[in-house]
């Protein structure tokens, strides 16, 4: 005897269509795009029913239910807005991702995603992953006047990339992105196998203040060309933080130099060094201090360090020098690893040109200069570490 004539569910169709269905005949149900087969509430990949000899189908008719993409992924440092309607996550629904203004910018796409027939939230470019909110780098409350200042006290937001590193001794670093710190290899060399011992503080102004954001190191990467106690060539290191930090006006990453950055780092261009290192009184500074200092001609600097007690060849092509011939304005012990920053006049963002590395026996000595790791030489190294880890 024939089985009851099957009726396709709403938003579905059956195949093959026959005048009647008898023993061993079968039909399949296919749903329209944006709808999925459900048996009860359970999704089916496919459905086929067979007519049995008692004249009944071997299984009940499924339904074609609208595809539900489910709640979209949260966006760290951003938010998601339902455009179609509150909490609507079904086929053709639209959502809009956006990043927290001022401190983050959206990478990858425009943030608009649609619930597609395959059940995935998809951007106009076909991406299924949510966009990324990247921290905006190089923002500072400070504007440069190009003048030379000596030992000025920093104000909140002036150097939001400044990182205080406490381990064996006091050192500094600069925040990159939201989970990396750029510093000098010599400053953290002793802790290279014990990253967790580094006490990393962000958003601090006073060295001893309890008001700061605590961070801890997950891993330390020291440049493979750096040799401890054998000069300061390749004096550069990266610290990966075990958590991303929240970016705000007091904690903002420094930019890495663009290819064009050297045009803002010529001889006599002004850079700014900041830190809690030794001051003229011979004590570590309580308040974050900064000094605006000019870049010194490389040959002039090399010559300055060829006289005893310095050995010839101390200043390499991987270094840049800054300071005054008359002395008095310099980085010092405790400032190691901190950034020498420059303003990119085109983007109006600050970038790191140098890392406080070494200098004369007596800081700020006349005729001697502060020596900094030349960051632009290490962009491939930095990017390689960050992308791989």
């Amino acid at each position: 005897q024939p089985c009851p004539y099957p009726m396709a569910p709403p938003n579905g169709h059956l195949s093959p269509v026959q005048a009647k269905y008898i023993l061993k005949d079968s039909f399949s149900i296919f749903c329209e795009p944006g709808y999925e087969l459900l048996q009860g509430h359970l999704p089916l990949k496919s459905f086929a029913a067979v007519c049995q000899k008692d004249g009944s189908w071997d299984q009940p008719m499924p339904s074609c239910s609208i595809v539900d993409c489910g709640p979209p992924d949260d966006l760290p440092s951003g938010r998601v807005e339902y455009i179609t309607g509150p909490e609507v996550t079904t086929y053709k629904a639209v959502i809009q991702y956006s990043c927290e203004e001022t401190f983050y910018t959206m990478k990858v796409n425009d943030g608009k995603y649609v619930c597609e027939a395959d059940g995935f939230w998809t951007s106009s470019k076909g991406e299924r992953s949510p966009p990324v909110c990247e921290p905006v780098c190089g923002l500072s409350a400070r504007t440069t006047g190009g003048q030379i200042y000596g030992g000025q006290k920093a104000k909140p937001g002036d150097f939001p990339w400044q990182v205080l590193i406490l381990g064996g001794s006091t050192a500094a670093g600069a925040l990159l992105y939201d989970n990396w710190v750029l510093t000098a290899a010599h400053a953290i060399y002793e802790q290279k196998h014990d990253a967790s011992s580094l006490d990393i503080r962000l958003g601090a102004l006073k060295r001893l203040s309890p008001h700061y954001t605590q961070a801890w190191a997950e891993a330390v990467f020291i440049h493979e060309g750096y040799t401890h106690d054998a000069g300061f060539d390749n004096d550069i290191a990266l610290i990966k933080l075990n958590n991303k930090v929240v970016i705000n006006s007091n904690i903002t990453p420094i930019c890495l130099p663009r290819k064009e950055a050297e045009s803002f780092m010529r001889t006599d261009d002004i850079g700014t060094a900041s830190g809690w290192g030794l001051t003229q009184r011979g004590l570590l500074a309580r308040n974050l201090m900064y000094v605006d200092i000019p870049i010194v001609d490389h040959q002039k600097c090399t010559a300055a360090y060829e006289k005893p007690p310095y050995s010839g060849g101390s200043v390499t092509a991987n270094m840049l020098c800054a300071g005054l011939e008359s002395g008095g304005k310099d980085a010092c012990r405790g400032d190691s690893g901190g950034a020498l920053v420059f303003l990119d006049n085109e983007t109006q963002r600050w970038f790191v040109g140098g890392i406080v590395s070494w200098g004369s026996m007596n800081c700020g000595e006349a005729g001697q200069y502060g020596v900094y790791t030349k960051v632009i030489n290490y962009i491939p190294w930095i990017k390689n570490i960050i992308s791989n880890f």
Epitope: Q39, H41, L42, P43, L44, K45, S46, D68, G70
Partner: antibody
């Protein structure tokens, strides 16, 4: 954010009935999008699905437990319950409740340990 | 009754790819689901309908299902991924779980 919390006695005597309740917070049990399920896990062993219920009272059970299981729902209290009769030591397990959305269990309750012992 | 089989244990080095398999008769014809369970915690859904990731699950988790085998792949495995993993499927409206695979991340 929906949360589920199991409650009930931690010790049940053999041959008696195990009774547990799952309280749903942060969402309505009467949502048409979800079933609500019970899953258990004997100590050191894997997961076993017990059964699921819709807010209307429609149920489906694991055939191996069907003769002993009753799952019910109380929409006024935003709760659903499990009863397992004639228990033995083999029913000793952590019992979880979970939201069942189109066949996927998410989220789960924290679980409650039930020991069957005299 | 329908059965899903998983290897009881497997190990992987950090940063490497872990592939956990789940086999069952014509499993590829139905949807597979994967759950992660860390010691003393409730299970967490990591993959549903073969290859879909719930909100909040890292992109390193992916899934596939064809023939008689479903696979959960964890690329760039991290120490935090050490856990028990269970596959699950629905056969004739009955929920079935695999026996679970204990994933150890070495080092």
């Amino acid at each position: 954010q929906v949360q589920l919390q199991e409650s009930g006695p931690g010790l049940v005597k053999p041959s008696e009935t195990l009774s547990l309740t799952c309280t749903v917070s942060g969402g309505s049990i009467s949502s048409s999008s979800y079933y609500w399920g019970w899953i258990r896990q004997p100590p050191g062993k894997g997961l076993e699905w017990i059964g699921s219920i819709y807010y209307s009272g429609s149920t489906y059970y694991n055939p191996s437990l069907k003769s002993r299981v009753t799952i019910s729902v109380d929409t006024s209290k935003n709760q659903f319950s499990l009863k397992l009769s004639s228990v033995t030591a083999a029913d000793t397990a952590v019992y979880y409740c979970a939201r069942d959305r189109r066949g996927r269990f998410d989220p789960w309750g924290q679980g409650t340990m039930v020991t069957v012992s005299s | 009754s329908y059965e899903l089989m998983q290897p009881p244990s497997m190990s992987v080095s950090p940063g490497q790819t872990a592939s956990i398999t789940c086999s069952g008769d014509k499993l590829g014809d139905i949807y597979a689901y994967w759950y992660q369970q860390k010691p003393g915690q409730s299970p967490v859904l990591v993959i549903y309908q073969d290859n879909k990731r719930p909100s909040g699950i890292p992109e390193r988790f992916s899934g596939s299902n064809s023939g008689n085998t479903a696979t959960l792949t964890i690329s760039g495995t991290q120490a935090m991924d050490e856990a028990d993993y269970y596959c699950q499927a629905w056969e004739s409206s009955t929920g079935v779980f695999g026996g679970g695979t204990k994933l150890t991340v070495l080092g």
